[in-house]
């Protein structure tokens, strides 16, 4: 070996100076009697080497690097040899920091693995190989006096946690625990923890289950869930408190917390939830009243709350078939009595024959809002209920009675906008209890089955705004019936449009007779169309060759018109405009020529 490098320290604080010397032995002088020693750090040549010849003939170069800013680099001592640089020796230099004090040391006792798991934060990067050791000892008191040392726990490379196995633990006694960090630049120690492993026990959560329904147990009430949990086996005898959290599966609701629950409750009825709603539930527990750590949340249990029987008022209305008065068509509408009135699965119409105690005969069971049935001859009344899996609504009696009450008067209707109609009336005396308002297409499209109806509960009302199923350009029949205590009044009806359409065509003009100065025209009126308001008038327009225009207004019953004062042998353009309150439309143009003065008149 021709050269040898010595350094003041191979590992230094990052940014600190470092001094190195390189000695070239005399027996290498065949390279060059006065060789020039060069220094290189990594790939860069470093100036500043001070070279001298020693008394024994060796050459020495000393260099001081003022700041070592590389965390790792090779320092080389070189000679120029021909055109290349010959490395005589090199050393690895490292720079970094002493270890910071490890912080946030915490431990958990795991009863499944029977070990104490401690973790910490190692602090900033040192850039140097740094070892961590979890150190501990047993102590009878509060760790002021050190008992038996426990075997050091050395984590795997790169890990910041370590497990102390059961054989080195003493439960229900304090242990002193700390982390020691060490590298070439120093040693640091975390603050010491003093703990009883059982005080940092982390339990596993119980397993949530739905309760098996037992025949003798009452089913859960609406909006309630019955659940139970299986305690975590290793924690069977540990006093714990638990908390439950739940949220609806649908929507963005956040978790709602219920607790504390004693672990040993083992079963629980959770109420105050939305009926017929799927919920996600989780449970977690903590050793209590002794110290401990909360378990993780249990795996989710998904359960659906039972529904509640429908809480609705059923507004009813009925109609008899004209040809068969015992065939009744019954209509109803559910009106919720509460914010959550329960799901409606269907409806049942039933009749209880007099003298047959307890016997109830169903007349129809449907999911629709109406049904048609044959009313037994002795039946004056039926009952209607809404039902679901939880039960039925309160029965609504429907009494079939003759209309004996007074009629309302002055029934009228007017358009509010193209999709609504106002129907008004003068209430009869005495006041009714309410009204039924029915509406549907008038003739020729009229149909009893396609009528919309509404119950107006206020007997003093003098009108009602129809907003459902109203379309423009359609004729509607509106029927209003007053309702009394045990009877009803006669129905009244009125026809109305919410918006009428302008005539779609004007009649075609035909020339009947023509002369030199006159022309007789005629037309066939368009038949009236539903949805189109009746014609109010016609206007006839004629224009001569000089583009002069003339017009005349005719009443709606006109079938023809004679144009007078025309010029002989002249060309005229004529058209007819048919007008209603909703607008007007023009006919096609008729072009004619009056006769020459010498010509004979045409009839």
């Amino acid at each position: 070996e021709c050269g040898h490098i010595s350094v003041s320290a191979p590992i230094v604080h990052l940014g600190d100076p470092i001094t190195a010397s390189c000695i070239i032995k005399q027996n290498c002088s065949h390279l060059d009697p006065e060789p020039q020693i060069l220094w290189r750090l990594g790939a860069e040549l470093q100036p500043g080497g001070r070279q001298q010849r020693l008394s024994d003939g060796t050459q020495e170069s000393i260099i001081t690097l003022p700041h070592l800013n590389h965390t790792q680099a090779f320092l080389s001592c070189c000679l120029n040899w021909g055109n290349s640089l010959q490395i005589l020796d090199q050393v690895e230099l490292r720079a970094g920091y002493p270890p910071a004090i490890p912080h946030n040391l915490s431990c958990l006792m795991n009863l499944t693995t029977s070990s104490l798991i401690c973790q910490w934060e190692p602090g900033p990067e040192t850039h140097l190989p740094t070892s961590f050791t979890l150190k501990s000892f047993k102590s009878r008191g509060n760790c002021q006096t050190q008992g038996d040392s426990i075997l050091d726990c050395v984590p795997k490379d790169g890990q910041s946690h370590c497990c102390i196995p059961r054989k080195h633990l003493l439960l229900y006694q304090n242990m002193g625990i700390w982390v020691q960090a060490e590298n070439a630049l120093g040693t640091s120690m975390s603050p010491q923890l003093c703990l009883d492993p059982m005080d940092v026990v982390k339990l596993e959560p119980p397993m949530l289950r739905t309760m098996d329904p037992s025949p003798e147990a009452a089913p859960p009430q609406a909006g309630c869930l019955q659940l139970c949990w299986e305690p975590w086996q290793p924690g069977l005898h540990i006093n714990q408190k638990c908390e439950l959290r739940h949220k609806p599966q649908r929507g963005e609701a956040s978790w709602a917390l219920v607790g504390p629950l004693p672990l040993e409750a083992l079963q629980y009825e959770l109420c105050g939830l939305l009926p017929a709603t799927a919920y996600t539930l989780q449970i977690r527990c903590i050793r209590w009243p002794l110290p401990g750590h909360w378990s993780d949340w249990s795996p989710s249990l998904e359960l659906r709350t039972t529904e509640r029987a429908p809480t609705v008022r059923l507004d009813t209305w009925w109609r008899q078939r004209q040809l068969d008065p015992r065939t009744v068509q019954l209509f109803w509408k559910p009106v919720p009595l509460e914010e959550d009135s329960g799901r409606i699965q269907g409806y049942v119409v039933s009749w209880r024959p007099s003298g047959q105690a307890g016997a109830i005969l169903p007349l129809c069971n449907t999911t629709e809002l109406s049904c048609t049935f044959h009313l037994p001859s002795e039946a004056q009344e039926v009952a209607l209920v809404a039902y679901n899996s939880a039960g039925t609504s309160r029965p609504t009696p429907v009494v079939f009675s003759e209309s004996r009450g007074p009629a309302l008067t002055r029934l009228h209707a007017m358009a509010r906008d193209p999709h609504s109609l106002w129907v008004g009336w003068e209430p009869p005396n005495p006041w009714p209890q309410g009204y039924v308002i029915e509406w549907g297409l008038g003739p020729p499209s009229a149909s009893n089955s396609n009528k919309t109806w509404r119950m107006e509960q206020n007997g003093r009302a003098t009108g009602f705004l129809l907003k459902e199923n109203i379309r423009p350009f359609q004729l509607y029949e509106i029927i209003v019936t007053p309702l009394y205590q045990d009877t009803m009044g006669p129905s009244q009806h009125v026809y109305a449009y919410s918006q009428e359409m302008a005539p779609s065509h004007a009649p075609e003009l035909h020339l009947k007779h023509i002369g030199k100065t006159w022309a007789q025209l005629e037309w066939v009126p368009e038949p009236p169309e539903l949805g189109k308001s009746p014609l109010t008038h016609y206007t006839i327009f004629w224009t001569n060759a000089q583009n002069q225009s003339f017009s005349a207004i005719l009443n709606a019953s006109s079938r023809g018109f004679v144009l007078h004062g025309l010029e002989p042998a002249s060309l005229y353009h004529i058209h007819l405009m048919a007008a209603s309150q909703a607008g007007a439309t023009n006919s096609t143009v008729l072009t004619l020529m009056t006769l020459t003065p010498e010509g004979s008149e045409l009839h």
């Epitope: 499944t112 029977s114 059961r166 069977l236 005898h237 540990i238 040993e264 409750a265 050793r287 009243p289």
Partner: antibody, heavy 118, light 107 residues
């Protein structure tokens, strides 16, 4: 110092009943599971029943299920064992014991002898 | 139910001997195994809990080991006061069960 004192043992005819009591002192009774262990003459230890700190969980050995009832009164620091339909094979010394969190019997009473014989 | 099998059921040993008693569970019980010592006419006394933890006041010549199904109680140097019957007990389930016992007698 933990002390457990059993009472209520004695001679009873087959089919008869007895109620054992265990008075506890020297620790917070309401925080601990408690249990009964018996030992027939010349035989080993047999677990009979245990009860959770607030009395909600009460497991029993198959040999006594349906006949024995364990209970506790935390206000009186007392554990009970109601024994009905007694049989000759129930003859034993009955020990009351305090359980630790890991299910070990940390402290025992001195025992009370129950003899079932006609 | 979990069965606990203790062996031997009895053994003779001299003062100063190393004595080992084993206990086997019919299914895994983690570390939930406790050892008791009982002398004639006396209540049992807890020696070791959670397989290897020495109860306060118990001499360090007693030690426990094992996990899962196989457990051992070791007395490193038998003393005259150690002649007694030893029981293991599992506390993994609510229905705790004891082993049949091992009687340690003077040789």
């Amino acid at each position: 110092e933990v002390q457990l004192l059993e009472s209520g043992g004695g001679l009873v005819q087959p089919g008869g009943s007895l109620r054992l009591s265990c008075a506890a002192s020297g620790f917070t009774f309401s925080l601990y599971w408690m249990g009964w262990v018996r030992q027939a003459p010349g035989k080993g230890l047999e677990w009979v029943s245990s009860i959770s700190s607030s009395g909600g969980v009460t497991p029993y050995a198959d040999s006594v299920k349906g006949r024995f009832t364990i209970s506790r009164d935390n206000s009186k620091n007392t554990l009970y064992l109601q024994m009905n339909s007694l049989r000759a094979e129930d003859t034993a010394v009955y020990y009351c014991a305090k359980l630790g969190e890991l299910g070990m019997y940390m402290n025992w009473g001195q025992g009370t002898l129950v003899t079932v014989s006609s | 139910d979990i069965q606990m099998t203790q062996s031997p059921s009895s053994l003779s040993a001299s003062v100063g001997d190393r004595v080992t008693i084993t206990c086997r569970a019919s299914q895994g019980i983690s570390s939930y195994l406790n050892w008791y010592q009982q002398k004639p006419g006396k209540a049992p006394k807890l020696l070791i809990y959670y397989a290897s933890n020495l109860q306060n006041g118990v001499p360090s010549r007693f030690s426990g080991s094992g996990s899962g199904t196989d457990f051992t109680l070791t007395i490193s140097s038998l003393q005259p006061e150690d002649f007694a019957t030893y029981y293991c007990q599992q506390s993994w389930t609510y229905g705790q069960t004891f082993g049949g016992g091992t009687k340690v007698e003077i040789k």
